[in-house]
């Protein structure tokens, strides 16, 4: 059952499993949900009843029967994990907390003019969990506006201290605002000879790789294969750390992998979420039941609906021996991962899915597309939508990306005599125009956000938001896109799709089916030769066929250019402008998201 | 079923201000733009503008731009239009029409405006 | 402003004839046109929008074609109660803008 209120003048007795300190009830609640065995915590507020070494300590419990006894105590707060909820969860957390000292390791100290600009250096700080920042009212003359970057093993402070005209917040990573480079690849026979801060065991190098991910001191990790020749290391993860952030050493080693956090994409990677089902494995773990199940299928459907269980083992039933039902095996550890893992048992092996509402939903996979052809598939391409003007009377007027569960993303030259939000109408999951009829269900649109350096689209900034009056509830035919990672700002993009209803040539009509088109990335310096009136920005991005053939055209404004980047699809432009349509050495001009991802969350997250 | 109820007939000396009243029922009022068109005896349709009663957007003909002003109670489900200045050039019948998915799918049944000394 | 012309202004028929009236827009208005019936002394009643698609209740005796700028509604079976006038629009674009009418009328 989900609980999301918070208890007040309450504490949960007994169940403890560890105990952290957090800034804020609500921040302990994110850091139980986050724990691997956590399902209800205690919190305590500052109060003069209670003694200042336990102010802002928060307990992590956990509880066979997911509940514990209550017991009234004033300044304690206590409430249940998001574990059990079904609605998307976060780590991001912008609050900044005002006369606050959060300790750990002071790694980095430096004068910032502002707690902001404080909390950008420690998002873009590889080592940063969270800051001090004292302010220029501090009575300490020499630290007033000094920032202190600070780390610790577990990510969240070591103690925390009242501090007057100091204030104290986290790094903003998890919010997807971190400018560090994303590297998704992972190297084969390589060992990264560095120190390690923890190891665990893992059935792949991209379990071990997202395990590093969510490990608050993880920076790199090296991963030994079943085939490596020390039996007693195979499937062994080592998370691995080091004080230039990068490998100091690398070995060339046969059946080792090696690779990097994904911190800084994790929003637009899985990296909760490890879906694969493992042959011929088993994971040894604390056994929580044995429950009889038709598949392995079923068997991680069990996991993922028992709140404690993290991963499993399912034996395939002997012939005709209890229905065709195997058995399962549900299991847990202390840090969520199997105690040993084992091979040629016969056994098939997973971890639970509830943990995937932590990742973002655009990184969930869609269904497999048609290749060739020009008209979609229904859930080709499930974060495109519709939009409608019903003025002068009810047509499509530009195409738009769902991104949020509240907000699509579209372009601002979509919005020209649009007198109000009230006149838009959204359709999500449409392969057809003509599916649309009367009564055809839609998202009103609550506001138009255009960018406030928006003149004409020729000139840049043509990027909008859309604020929807009701939220999209994801299904197989309407789901977001990831924005892209601005550590991808690097990333060559080759699987490269435009779509939309627009005009197949210049004098047409929109389209009744949903069109699509592979073009490939232009660069920069290329398209501006072939746009020698206009200036083409970095805020800019080109995409074309130099014999044209292939673009989009009126009606496609607004609409995605979306790139398949390591399976998960990011929106890396949205259609803007160009000469004509599909003309020989005539790109279509796109406005470079990655360039507003700052923008974007800005209004998106704004409370 | 969707109706369009309009006010009765109306005589005017020129000069004067009139105000007809077009009461809709059987659907969301607030969802669809209301129009009015003029059609003076024996001729065609005119266009004079139009009205979102959700958020009072407008667009007048620029012919009627000075003169209509175009309004919705929502709280009624009632759209009026207010023509001032009148000349005999006005007297004609003035209908409401709501525009529906893809066209004036209802219509009132007209208020016949006179005008005369 | 986007002119309709519509033609012929009046015609005479008999029942059981195929009756043609045109609408000639002074732009591209892609599809975005309505064929609207009136009787003496009533409203008008739609008949076709969207250039060719009949709306509910329309006997399928009256149908619509064309696209860009010329647009057709064709009576195949001319009746004795389609006696009215007939007016195109257009909604393409603001603003809205109806032919003058063509008046139909029984031999």
């Known amino acids: 059952e989900c609980v999301t209120q918070l208890l007040k003048d309450t504490c949960f007795e007994g169940g403890d499993i560890t105990t952290v300190f957090t800034p804020s009830a609500k921040y302990c609640q994110v850091v139980c949900t986050y724990h691997p065995r956590c399902l209800l915590f205690t919190f305590t507020a500052e109060s003069p009843s209670e003694d200042p070494t336990r102010w802002f300590t928060c307990v992590l419990k956990d509880s066979v029967t997911e509940t514990l006894p209550r017991v009234n105590r004033t300044a304690a707060i206590s409430g249940y994990s998001f574990k059990q909820c079904s609605h998307q969860i976060s780590a991001c957390n912008k609050d900044i907390y005002v006369d606050l000292d959060m300790k750990g390791i002071n790694y980095n100290s430096s004068v910032a003019k502002s707690a902001q600009e404080c909390q950008e250096r420690c998002t873009d700080d590889v080592h940063c969990h969270f800051f001090t920042y004292a302010t220029r009212q501090f009575p300490s003359l020499e630290h007033r506006n000094i920032c202190l970057l600070k780390h610790t093993q577990t990510g969240t402070p070591t103690r925390i201290t009242k501090l007057d005209k100091v204030v104290s917040g986290f790094s903003l990573k998890s919010c997807a605002l971190s400018n560090l480079a994303c590297i998704r690849d992972i190297f084969p026979n390589t060992v990264f000879a560095d120190s390690n801060i923890d190891s665990v065991m893992a059935p792949d190098a991209f379990v071990c790789g997202r395990i590093c991910t969510h490990h608050p001191g993880c920076l790199f990790f090296t991963f030994f294969s079943q085939e490596w020749p020390k039996e007693s290391q195979r499937n062994l993860c080592l998370l691995k750390t080091s004080e230039s952030g990068l490998p100091s050493t690398r070995i060339k080693k046969s059946k080792a992998l090696s690779g990097f956090s994904l911190q800084s994409c994790r929003h637009s990677i899985p990296v909760f979420c490890h879906s694969s089902f493992y042959h011929d494995t088993d994971f040894l773990g604390e056994e929580l039941d044995i429950v009889a199940a038709k598949s392995h299928e079923a068997c991680q459907k069990l996991c993922t609906n028992a709140v404690r269980c993290q991963f499993f083992t399912y034996t395939p039933a002997q012939a005709s021996c209890n229905e065709g039902k195997g058995k399962c095996y549900l299991k847990l550890s202390s840090n969520g991962s199997p105690t040993k893992i084992l091979h040629g048992r016969g056994g098939i092996s997973g971890y639970t899915l509830r943990l995937c509402k932590m990742d973002n939903e655009c990184t969930t996979k869609i269904k497999p597309r048609i290749v060739g052809g020009t008209a979609s598939v229904r859930g080709e391409w499930p974060w495109q939508v519709t939009l409608h003007t019903t003025s002068p009377t009810q047509r499509h007027l530009c195409g738009g990306s769902i991104i949020g569960n509240q907000w699509i993303l579209t372009a601002a030259h979509c919005f020209y005599g649009v007198e109000s939000p009230k006149i838009l109408r959204v359709y999500s999951g449409i392969l057809n125009q003509s599916e649309i009829k009367e009564d055809t269900s839609f998202f009103g649109v609550q506001e138009i956000i255009i960018h406030d350096q928006y003149k004409m689209a020729e000139s840049g900034y043509d990027i909008a938001l859309l604020k929807l009056e009701t939220t999209v509830n994801y299904t197989d035919s309407q789901r977001p896109i990831c924005l892209p990672s601005k550590g991808d700002r690097n990333v060559i993009y080759t699987d490269c799709w435009v779509t939309g209803w627009g005009y197949r040539k210049l004098r047409d009509k929109i389209q009744n089916t949903l069109q699509k088109a592979k073009i490939p990335l232009v660069t920069n310096e290329e398209c501006q030769k072939r746009y020698r009136g206009h200036k083409i920005t970095h805020k800019m991005i080109c995409a074309g066929y130099r014999e044209g053939g292939k673009d989009a055209c009126k009606g496609d404004s607004g609409g995605p250019l979306s790139c398949k980047h390591n399976e998960v699809w990011h929106l890396v432009g949205i259609t803007s402008w160009g000469e004509g349509c599909a003309q020989r050495e005539r790109p279509g001009v796109y406005t470079n998201v990655v360039e507003y991802v700052d923008w974007i969350l800005e209004k998106t997250q704004a409370v | 079923q969707v109706q369009l109820v309009q006010s009765g007939s109306e005589l005017k000396k020129p000069g004067a201000s009139v105000k007809l009243s077009c009461k809709a029922s059987?659907?969301?009022?607030?969802?669809?733009?209301m129009h009015w068109v003029k059609q003076a005896h024996g001729q065609g349709l005119e266009w004079i503008g139009n009205?979102?009663?959700?958020?009072?957007?407008?667009n007048y003909d620029e012919k009627f731009r000075t003169r209509a002003t175009l309004t919705a109670d929502t709280s009624t489900s009632t759209a009026y239009m207010h023509l001032s200045s009148l000349t005999s050039e006005d007297s004609a019948v003035y209908y409401c029409?709501?525009?529906?998915?893809?066209?004036?799918?209802?219509w009132g049944q007209g208020t016949s405006v006179t005008v005369s000394s | 402003d986007i002119v309709m012309t519509q033609s012929p202004s009046s015609l005479s028929a008999s029942v059981g004839d195929r009756v043609t009236i045109t609408c000639k827009a002074s732009?591209?208005?892609?599809?975005?046109v309505s064929w609207f019936q009136q009787k003496p002394g009533q409203a008008p009643k739609l008949l076709i929008y969207?250039?060719?698609n009949r709306y509910t209740g329309v006997p399928d005796r009256f149908s619509g074609s064309g696209s860009g700028t010329d647009f057709t509604l064709t009576i195949s079976s001319l009746q004795a109660e389609d006696v009215a006038t007939y007016h195109c629009?257009?909604?393409?674009?603001?603003?809205?803008?109806f032919g003058q009418g063509t008046k139909l009328e029984i031999k």
């Open positions: 029409t709501r525009m529906g998915f893809y066209a004036m799918d209802y």
């Open positions: 059987g659907y969301t009022f607030t969802r669809y733009w």
């Open positions: 009205i979102y009663p959700d958020s009072d957007s407008t």
């Open positions: 732009e591209n208005v892609v599809t975005y």
């Open positions: 969207g250039a060719s």
């Open positions: 629009g257009q909604s393409y674009s603001y603003p809205l803008t």
